[in-house]
């Protein structure tokens, strides 16, 4: 048999079928010009040592081969005795180790039978009725089509499906959309209506991620506050990556997982802007307020689940930072300013009551006075803190109040509101004989001392009412009770006793007369 | 010379099943690929299925495949074809064929119909 012709007889090789799973396949046939015919295929396994041979069964029954030898493509003319406008079956036979396997066969009029090319360039791919839609533009004269794809996820083999006739410039697929893994995708053309025409190549694969983006499984943490009053929040424990197809593994535009953090600033409610997006991967600076952390995947089909924390707000006090002086026309606050042109946000709530209560007010952009410090003050009128009761305020400072991660914790620290001085006196104030010579005075503990850092002490007098000398006593805040000692026998006393913050004297308790009687002796 | 008789058609209802013979002499039946081929009514003739020599490999054309099997016996000289689940459209006269030269028999005719 000469080499370019098709050779009617038995091929050169024992017959020994393997059955096995590697071997040739993906024949594909056509005419690449007017008298001249292709066939190429793929063969999988080691390849060494390996020949082909191309097989061709006419209409008549006769049957011969082509001998390809190591080559996987094979070109040959219309006088090769292969009958081009007739049905002929081609597959191909390749032998190797002693075995012959087999290619599936493809049936076709070879005249007609045309190179069709598989999707080419971008494949546009959306979500339609749960089900993804694949678009793509029609090869250059290649209008009439047949469409098939082919799909798989990282656990399972390929699946075989259709996308029917195709007839226009464009061309689209209605695919499966996975819930919750990614798949790979690829398409392959024929020519439409042309009995056994041959397959297209499989395009190049398109990586598609499941509908519902995988939820973030993370965790942070908050590291302490600093020094200029900002705390670093960081990620403990990197998002899951998704799982890929082979072919999608590496580069795989379309399957992307995108994670944003978006962080709502709790505290402080009366500022511009509450809520910020940002990219996980910079994790950002925050000031002591409370926040909500979500973490929210998205990808191209839209968002996911998110994944919410809560980061409470850092209590640590700072008892002195805070001069509040109270006058008649009302309550300034002063505290050592940050910088120049400074926003600052004052917000306080009472004490034991739910963080949703808190009030708070922006100040103008202000710079420091002469003594440095910054200011903020209120009158009676606007009942600001007004209540006498215990208030947490914290001041917050921005040079960028529209940026969320730009404020810093000035300080936080409580405040006794409304008249302190009145509402802080000492009651239940009690003289007990402690000797001949000496009392113990006890009192209920002042409304102040429920306010932390803000009860500086107390102040117990006792005045002499013969002589009218006074002695004063300072008592820790902590103590509810003092001896006075060097008191003479029938001799009237008053005692009274007050309780002082760092910036207001108390006013005094009710006076109570005591004395210690005379001991006659028998 | 070389001969080729086949045997074993007959009137099916569809769904039924024939199994086709053909005996072959005249030639070492064993050292060549067989075909079994058909002509239906007003029609040219169409390749059925392809067995090799020592019978290791079998080929179909699509319409087929899954249905009809396609089976030698080289010690007895024999080529068979069984038909299963046929179809009206499978009514035609069936030949085998010697795949090297083409040569052929006289066929056996294949009917179904309800």
């Known amino acids: 048999c000469r080499t370019s012709e098709c050779c009617f007889q038995d091929p050169p090789y024992p017959d020994a079928d393997s059955g096995s799973a590697s071997g040739p396949r993906d024949l594909r046939c056509y005419r690449i010009s007017s008298d001249r015919y292709e066939c190429s295929w793929q063969y999988e396994g080691p390849t060494a040592g390996v020949s082909h041979f191309l097989r061709c069964c006419l209409s008549s029954g006769r049957c011969c081969y082509f001998a390809a030898g190591s080559a996987t493509r094979l070109q040959f003319s219309d006088q090769a005795g292969v009958s081009v406008l007739y049905t002929v079956t081609l597959w191909v036979e390749s032998w190797a180790r002693n075995q012959t396997e087999k290619s599936p066969e493809v049936t076709l009029q070879l005249y007609n039978s045309v190179k069709y090319e598989p999707p080419l360039g971008d494949i546009k791919v959306s979500k339609l009725a749960g089900q993804l839609r694949m678009e793509w533009e029609t090869p250059d004269n290649q209008v009439g089509a047949e469409v098939q794809f082919r799909h798989r996820t990282p656990s399972s083999p390929w699946k075989l499906g259709d996308c029917g006739p195709q007839d226009d410039d464009t061309e689209s697929c209605l695919c499966p959309l996975e819930m919750n893994v990614a798949q790979e995708f690829q398409l392959r053309r024929r020519q439409l209506g042309s009995q056994g025409s041959s397959w297209s190549k499989w395009s190049s694969p398109v990586c598609v991620p499941p509908e519902n983006p995988p939820q973030p499984q993370v965790r942070f943490s908050v590291e302490q506050l600093g020094q200029d009053g900002r705390r670093r929040l960081t990620l403990k424990e990197q998002p899951t990556q998704l799982e890929l197809p082979e072919g999608c593994q590496g580069l795989a535009p379309g399957t992307e997982v995108t994670y944003r953090l978006q962080l709502h600033m709790l505290s402080c409610p009366c500022k511009a802007k509450a809520t910020r997006t940002l990219h996980l991967g910079k994790m950002p600076y925050l000031s002591g307020a409370a926040y909500n952390v979500a973490v929210i995947s998205s990808n191209q089909f839209g968002p996911g689940l998110n994944q919410t924390w809560h980061i409470p707000a850092d209590t640590h006090t700072e008892p002195v930072a805070l001069n509040i002086s109270v006058g008649t026309n009302g309550t300034t606050m002063y505290w050592p300013a940050r910088a120049q042109s400074m926003t600052y946000c004052i917000e306080w709530q009472p004490v034991g009551q739910d963080g949703g209560l808190a009030t708070c007010s922006l100040t103008a952009p202000q710079d420091p006075d002469p003594a440095g410090m910054a200011t903020y003050s209120w009158s009676r009128e606007s009942g600001a803190m007004g209540q006498e009761k215990c208030y947490y305020i914290t001041i917050f400072a921005s040079a960028h109040p529209e940026k969320l991660t730009l404020w810093s914790t000035v300080l936080s620290t409580y405040h006794f509101g409304g008249n302190a001085s009145a509402a802080g006196t000492p009651h239940h104030v009690s003289v007990k004989n402690h000797s001949l010579d000496s009392v113990s005075v006890d009192w209920a503990p002042s409304l102040l001392s429920t306010c932390p850092g803000v009860l500086k002490e107390y102040v117990v007098r006792c005045r002499d009412e013969d002589s009218k000398q006074v002695s004063e006593h300072p008592v820790q805040p902590t103590e509810t009770q003092v001896t006075l000692s060097g008191l003479r026998a029938g001799v009237a006393y008053t005692v009274q006793v007050r309780a002082d913050t760092a910036w207001l004297r108390g006013v005094w308790s009710q006076p109570q007369r005591f004395s210690i009687e005379v001991q006659v002796s028998d | 010379q070389l001969q080729l008789v086949e045997s074993g058609g007959g009137l099916v209802q569809p769904g039924g099943s024939l199994r086709l013979s053909c005996a072959a002499s005249g030639f070492t039946f064993s050292s060549y690929g067989m075909s079994w081929v058909r002509q239906a009514p007003g029609k040219g003739l169409e390749w059925v299925s392809y067995?090799?020599?020592?019978?290791?490999?079998?080929t179909y054309v699509d319409f087929v495949k899954g249905r009809f099997t396609i089976s030698r016996d080289n010690a007895k000289n024999m080529l068979y074809l069984q038909m299963n689940s046929l179809k009206p459209e499978d009514t035609a006269v069936y030949y085998c064929?010697?795949?090297?030269?083409?040569?052929r028999g006289q066929g056996t005719q294949v009917t179904v119909e309800p």
């Open positions: 067995i090799s020599a020592g019978g290791g490999t079998t």
């Open positions: 064929v010697h795949a090297a030269d083409g040569s």
